[in-house]
Interface confidence: low
Amino acid sequence: YDFTNCDFEKIKAAYLSTISKDLITYMSGTKSTEFNNTVSCSNRPHCLTEIQSLTFNPTAGCASLAKEMFAMKTKAALAIWCPGYSETQINATQAMKKRRKRKVTTNKCLEQVSQLQGLWRRFNRPLLKQQ
């Protein structure tokens, strides 16, 4: 999906009002320094591409983020403020329904959500800041 047509300011508002808080809730009890940010993005469409990938694509050790509150709100924001996004996600949604809800927050998932927090912060301050 091409994220260049999204309404970035509306998505930013959704992040600041709710998504950011849900990410913090998910990460509660984890030190902010526990994970190194290895994923970055250089501008807002690029950030949304990375956010979508980390939020909705199952990875080894963390297959279940898509049913988390922050993920559902992310999906809603993208569906509302990115023209045509919903249509591209129909197959992905059907596949998601077949997955079972996670029982335990694995360390891999915590690491992945930590990366997401970094991507969302970059979305709000777009431009790659190389370490």
């Epitope: 260049t4 250089s42 501008n43 807002r44 469409p45 690029h46 301050r125």
Partner: antibody, heavy 117, light 107 residues
Framework: QVQLVQSGAEVKKPGASVKVSCKAS????????MHWVKQAPGQGLEWIGV????????TYNQKFKGKATLTVDTSTSTAYMELSSLRSEDTAVYYC??????????WGQGTLVTVSS | DIQMTQSPSSLSASVGDRVTITCRAS??????LAWYQQKPGKSPKLLVY???RPAAGVPSRFSGSGSGTDFTLTISSLQPEDFATYYC?????????FGQGTKVEIK
Amino acid sequence: QVQLVQSGAEVKKPGASVKVSCKASGYTFTSYWMHWVKQAPGQGLEWIGVIDPSDTYTTYNQKFKGKATLTVDTSTSTAYMELSSLRSEDTAVYYCTRSLDGFFDYWGQGTLVTVSS
Amino acid sequence: DIQMTQSPSSLSASVGDRVTITCRASENIYSYLAWYQQKPGKSPKLLVYFARRPAAGVPSRFSGSGSGTDFTLTISSLQPEDFATYYCQHHYDTPWTFGQGTKVEIK
């Protein structure tokens, strides 16, 4: 309305330094990156570097590292670019321009820096 | 660094003509391309960003297209005020680079 107003033309001798200012108005200064672009006489545009006014993070085009130094004064919403060890090839119009996603939507009027002995 | 190559470097056209300027990136920049217009003694003016999105206040005769490495700026019907130099610029990642410019002159 958004405005970027730059300082006036400068004539400097080789080896000297010059500091160009860019005063921003009409928007929240710390919400946008401030870039500087060089245009030598009759030539194209060359990106020098960028500063984030919110935390003064800078990144430079490798070509201008050691030549240009970018700073900001958030109390006056002003960005500065200092050019050191001036040489004749530094003669150019220098623009400040703001961005959020890497494209430049508002530009200053330009400052001509002439290096001549 | 990503190199941006514009063609032609100059062209002559008449009022009412359809004008096309192309820009090629040395690697994939997706849709991260902007176009600017610059008149002598003036600052550049943003025309198009994200390859095809028109900047505020830009006349509809200006349009951008392309993605990946090949991009086009089209002026559907050239007006007297459109005679200027046009630059492309990638905004994919640092360092940002510009094309060498295309000068549009009166035939």
